[in-house]
């Protein structure tokens, strides 16, 4: 029962985590304009992995996609790659874990196969979560570096007259969504790995017993026979589990009334 709960909870937590990773990847607010001395700004800039946006105090919002691939910073490309890898691994993990769920019966799938699948999905979730956390952290580091660089030359001009105020960017909502989502996916993966240990059948260590039949004698030595768990019994006594799995664009819009809470 505890195994099923752990597996189910791991699946749900990972599902939420992966949904969060997808949401974070699609979000436009990876970096937002720093409102250091002006909490209300007439023009507010924010950027995502795929496009940058400008929201005016008029309510008009304009977003422009990054239509170049070669012209983008290598770090941004790396973050994109990490997030996509995280999503792909997470999606495959979810697919595998659905079939691995103890509460779902698919044909005559053995518990050992479910244990292997649970472990596989768990590892995939862990790697997926790590990819998301790494991607978000790389982007955050890039922001911090740029923030202090732009602070150093915040005011540039001639003869002491302020000409341009450089726009500084700080952490956007997507970073926090990404960190939390990556963490959840990671936790879900660990839970799946823990559940896998419970699903794996224990080796039955029977004592060697000699059965003496009339006429001739046959000695039965115990092997790693599958423990009879779940539905039905292991009538064929096949040695199918040997403990091996037990290791650890451009868009323009005006808002509607519902855009604000």
């Amino acid at each position: 029962m505890a195994v099923t709960a752990c597996q189910g909870l791991g699946f749900v937590v990972s599902l939420i985590g992966i949904a969060g990773i997808i949401a974070a990847t699609c979000m436009d607010q990876w970096s937002t304009q720093d409102l250091y001395n002006n909490p209300v700004t007439a023009v507010f800039n924010y950027q995502g992995l795929w496009r940058s946006c400008v929201r005016e105090s008029s309510g008009f919002t304009e977003c422009r996609g990054y239509f170049t691939l070669l012209g983008l910073p290598a770090m941004l490309q790396a973050v994109r790659a990490l997030m996509i890898v995280g999503i792909v691994l997470g999606a495959i993990g979810l697919l595998v874990s659905i079939f691995a769920l103890k509460c779902i019966r698919i044909g005559s799938m053995e518990d050992s196969a479910k244990a292997n699948m649970t472990l596989t999905s768990g590892i995939m979730f862990i790697v997926s979560g790590l990819c998301a956390i790494a991607g978000v952290s790389v982007f955050a580091n890039m922001l911090v570096t740029n923030f202090w660089m732009s602070t150093a030359n915040m005011y540039t001009g001639m003869g002491g007259m302020v000409q341009t105020v450089q726009t500084r960017y700080t952490f956007g909502a997507a970073l926090f969504v990404g960190w939390v989502a990556g963490g959840l996916t990671l936790i879900g993966g660990v839970m799946m790995c823990i559940a896998c240990r419970g699903l794996a059948p224990e080796e039955t260590n029977y004592k060697a017993v000699s059965y003496h039949a009339s006429g001739h004698s046959v000695a039965y030595k115990p092997g790693g026979f599958k423990a009879s768990t779940g539905f039905g019994s292991n009538t064929k006594n096949k040695k199918i589990y040997d403990g091996g799995a037990r290791t650890e664009d451009e868009v323009q819009s005006y808002p509607s009334k519902h855009d604000y809470v």
Epitope: Q33, T41, A42, V54, T164
Partner: antibody, heavy 115, light 113 residues
Framework: EVQLVESGGGLVQPGGSLRLSCAVS?????MNWVRQAPGKGLEWVAW????????TYADDFKGRFTISRDDSKNTLYLQMNSLRAEDTAVYYC???????????WGQGTLVTVSS | DIQMTQSPSSLSASVGDRVTITCKSS????????????LTWYQQKPGKAPKLLIY???TLESGVPSRFSGSGSGTDYTLTISSLQPEDFATYYC?????????FGQGTKVEIK
């Protein structure tokens, strides 16, 4: 079609108060009050997000003027307190549009502060 | 606050003339996010409310005649009337639309010569 109609202007004594109204019809996301002293240029007074009610004021009017809106009446207000002679002007309500420009203006209402 | 300085404060011109009004801001009005300059131009006739002519420094408001054009970036901007018409005699204002508080130039009065 957006229509803006101001009312509430008139003669008031220095130190007195007055509340201007602007009846709004049509789509308005953010509204402003802009004033123009007789024979002088335009001066922005205040801005309000019509959905959140978030206001912003020019430094000269902070603490004295309050911009607000009534959703049910589709009306924008400017509450003016501690009025001075230099507040004498034609007050316009104006809609902010793409590019942060004022595309629709009311006809204006004259506020005279005099003893 | 961003200061807006218009020049000249007044000018006399004849119908058909090419008129140029300049506006200088104390700070750049160019937004790095979309590479647009947040400067707006208005026309005001006596006893009337101002009329929006140009936004984003060079984008013509719908319904505004094409003889009006705007240019410039950073801190220096220009409004040009290619061929002055009788109805164009008015006062013109530039506006900082980039940051609060929104500020206007002192105005340029275009009079008949």
């Amino acid at each position: 079609e957006v229509q803006l109609v101001e009312s509430g202007g008139g003669l008031v004594q220095p130190g007195g108060s007055l509340r201007l109204s602007c009846a709004v019809s049509g789509y308005t996301f953010s509204m402003n009050w802009v004033r123009q002293a007789p024979g002088k240029g335009l001066e922005w007074v205040a801005w309000i997000n019509m959905y959140t009610g978030e206001p912003t004021y020019a430094d000269d009017f902070k603490g004295r003027f309050t911009i607000s809106r009534d959703d049910s009446k589709n009306t924008l207000y400017l509450q003016m307190n501690s009025l001075r002679a230099e507040d004498t002007a034609v007050y316009y309500c104006a809609r902010l549009v793409k590019g942060n420009g004022f595309d629709y203006w009311g006809q204006g209402t004259l506020v005279t502060v005099s003893s | 606050d961003i200061q807006m300085t218009q020049s000249p404060s007044s000018l006399s011109a004849s119908v058909g003339d090419r008129v140029t009004i300049t506006c200088k801001s104390s700070q750049s009005l160019l937004n790095s996010g979309n590479q647009k300059s947040y400067l707006t131009w208005y026309q005001q006739k006596p006893g009337k409310a101002p009329k929006l002519l140009i936004y984003w420094a060079s984008t013509l408001e719908s319904g505004v005649p094409s003889r009006f054009s705007g240019s410039g970036s950073g801190t220096d901007y220009t409004l040009t009337i290619s061929s002055l018409q009788p109805e164009d005699f008015a006062t013109y204002y530039c506006q900082n639309a980039y940051s609060f508080p929104f500020t206007f130039g002192q105005g340029t009065k275009v009079e008949i010569k």
